[in-house]
């Protein structure tokens, strides 16, 4: 929140705001760092004590239509021998995300922000243990 | 939704693409299961690659606050709780997107922005390179 | 129908530690971060800091980041505020409150805790 | 952090009348200003949020305006039940701090 966005020194009056309807938001869609690429270190998914796979999930009624989203392969993690160790957990990571959902009600279409939960990925982990009493 | 009348005649062939401008409602619809058992808030602290998270808030975006993760060690607690440094952490990122107010300081009017967080940390084998 | 109910008054004596609770009904307690905001008798406001139950992040005002703890506990759907080594300036009543990370504000808000630190 | 300055410290409106409360940031806070009533042995309620947006269920009496540094709150037409103490407050980037607060009294 500190960094001020660079070329706008000055504030916005609200009559240079776009007019929205009650209710609505107007949202562009050209998506600003499009291009930019995730500099993640090198195939961790595989390397990763507990390793995780991908799937891609589709759905045209939805932008962006493809989410991938990461499935932990193992329930232990991965030893030093490369053997699953079932004393540790492999437990997923996961981070909220927006999209926007297209609706068809009869010849009408509407548009709907939508968040979504994406499993990012695994990490290893100590497990709870339960004592009974 | 805000609802935008189709084409007269209503068509059946489907325009594949979305507008660039959409009016969205206000009211954003939460898909997520939040009984999901796996959401845990501890996994920071008990994993074998453990990180802090900071609290990064830029009142542009929507959302307005994003917790981002940081490692806390180069390598990874072994089973006595030690660091090793063998092992590597390294922090898992994740596209996300953000709503951008476009044009600044306008409350409903935004734009779509890429960003990049760390989510979590993981530990992984380091890649490592012989040098001739 | 969301509700913050926090825990009774506290009398300490200078020196001592104060815990207290929050307990949320009414939503998705992991969805919204807890803060913790003070007020002295006849005062203003004074922000000490925030949790976010669904990840254990937390960040403290640094007036008092070496004296106050704030928790969580998923199970009960409670947060808690520690300040410790609490002096008679900490006099106020405390207040917690639900800020919507997305939207960025404060809407719901605890009834308020009175601490009176007296020896 | 950014200092939250509100005038005037009391004002004396009466019923059906006008208020302005004004409340002024030490440095830019975009539109990150909400604004809060207090009634003796209550805890804060939201009035607006985002400098000029209505929270659900506050009357349409109330209304905020302002971005950068400069707030206010506008109170068309005083009831009975609107004199308290008035906070504005950011979140533009924490510590969020409060102003000292605005009395609102009967004249």
């Known amino acids: 929140r500190k960094i001020p966005k660079v070329g706008h020194t000055f504030f916005q009056k609200p009559e240079s705001c776009p007019p929205v309807p009650g209710g609505s938001m107007k949202l562009d869609i050209g998506i600003i760092n499009e291009n930019q690429r995730v500099s993640m270190s090198r195939n961790i998914e595989s390397r990763s004590t507990s390793p995780w796979n991908y799937t891609v999930t589709w759905d045209p009624n939805r932008y962006p239509s493809e989410v991938v989203q990461a499935q932990c392969r193992n329930l232990g993690c991965i030893n030093a021998q490369g053997k699953e160790d079932i004393s540790m957990n492999s437990v997923p990571i996961q981070q909220e995300t927006l999209v926007v959902r297209r609706k068809h009600q009869g010849c009408s279409v509407s548009f709907q922000l939508e968040k979504v939960l994406v499993t990012v990925g695994c990490t290893c982990v100590t497990p709870v243990i339960h004592h009974v009493q | 939704g805000i609802t935008i009348p189709r084409n007269p005649g209503c068509p059946n062939s489907e325009d594949k693409n979305f507008p660039r401008t959409v009016m969205v409602n206000l009211n954003i619809h939460n898909r997520n299961t939040n009984t999901n058992p796996k959401r845990s808030s501890d996994y920071y602290n008990r994993s074998t690659s453990p990180w802090n998270l900071h609290r990064n808030e830029d009142p542009e975006r929507y959302p307005s606050v994003i917790w981002e993760a940081k490692c806390r060690h180069l390598g990874c607690i072994n089973a006595d709780g030690n660091v090793d440094y063998h092992m590597n952490s390294v922090p898992i990122q994740q596209e996300i997107l953000v709503l951008r107010r476009e044009p600044p300081h306008c409350p409903n009017s935004f734009r779509l922005e890429k960003i990049l967080v760390s989510v979590g940390c993981t530990c992984v084998t380091p890649i490592v390179h012989h040098v001739a | 129908e969301v509700q913050l109910v926090q825990s009774g008054a506290e009398v300490k004596k200078p020196g001592a530690s104060v815990k207290v609770s929050c307990k949320a009904s009414?939503?998705?307690?992991?969805?919204?971060?807890f803060h913790w905001v003070r007020q002295a008798p006849g005062q203003g406001l004074e922000w000490m800091g925030v949790i976010h139950p669904g990840n254990g992040g937390t960040a403290y005002n640094q007036n008092f980041r070496d004296r106050v703890t704030i928790t969580a506990d998923k199970s009960t759907s409670t947060a808690y505020m520690e300040l410790s080594s609490l002096r008679s300036e900490d006099t106020a009543v405390y207040y917690c409150a639900r800020f919507l990370t997305y939207e960025g504000y404060f809407d719901y808000w605890g009834q308020g805790t009175l601490v009176t630190v007296s020896s | 952090e950014i200092v939250m300055t509100q005038s005037p410290a009391t004002l004396s409106v009466s019923p059906g009348e006008r208020a302005t409360l004004s409340c002024k940031a030490s440095?830019?806070?975009?539109?990150?200003v909400g604004w809060f009533q207090q009634k003796p042995g209550q805890s804060p309620r939201l009035l607006i949020y985002h400098a000029s947006n209505r929270y659900t269920g506050v009357p349409a009496r109330f209304s905020g305006s302002g971005s950068g540094t400069d707030f206010t709150l506008t109170i068309s037409s005083l009831q009975p039940e609107d004199f308290a103490v008035y906070f504005c407050q950011q979140d533009y980037s924490s510590p969020y701090t409060f102003g000292q607060g605005t009395k609102l009294e009967i004249k």
């Open positions: 009414g939503y998705t307690f992991t969805d919204y971060e």
């Open positions: 440095q830019s806070v975009s539109i990150d």
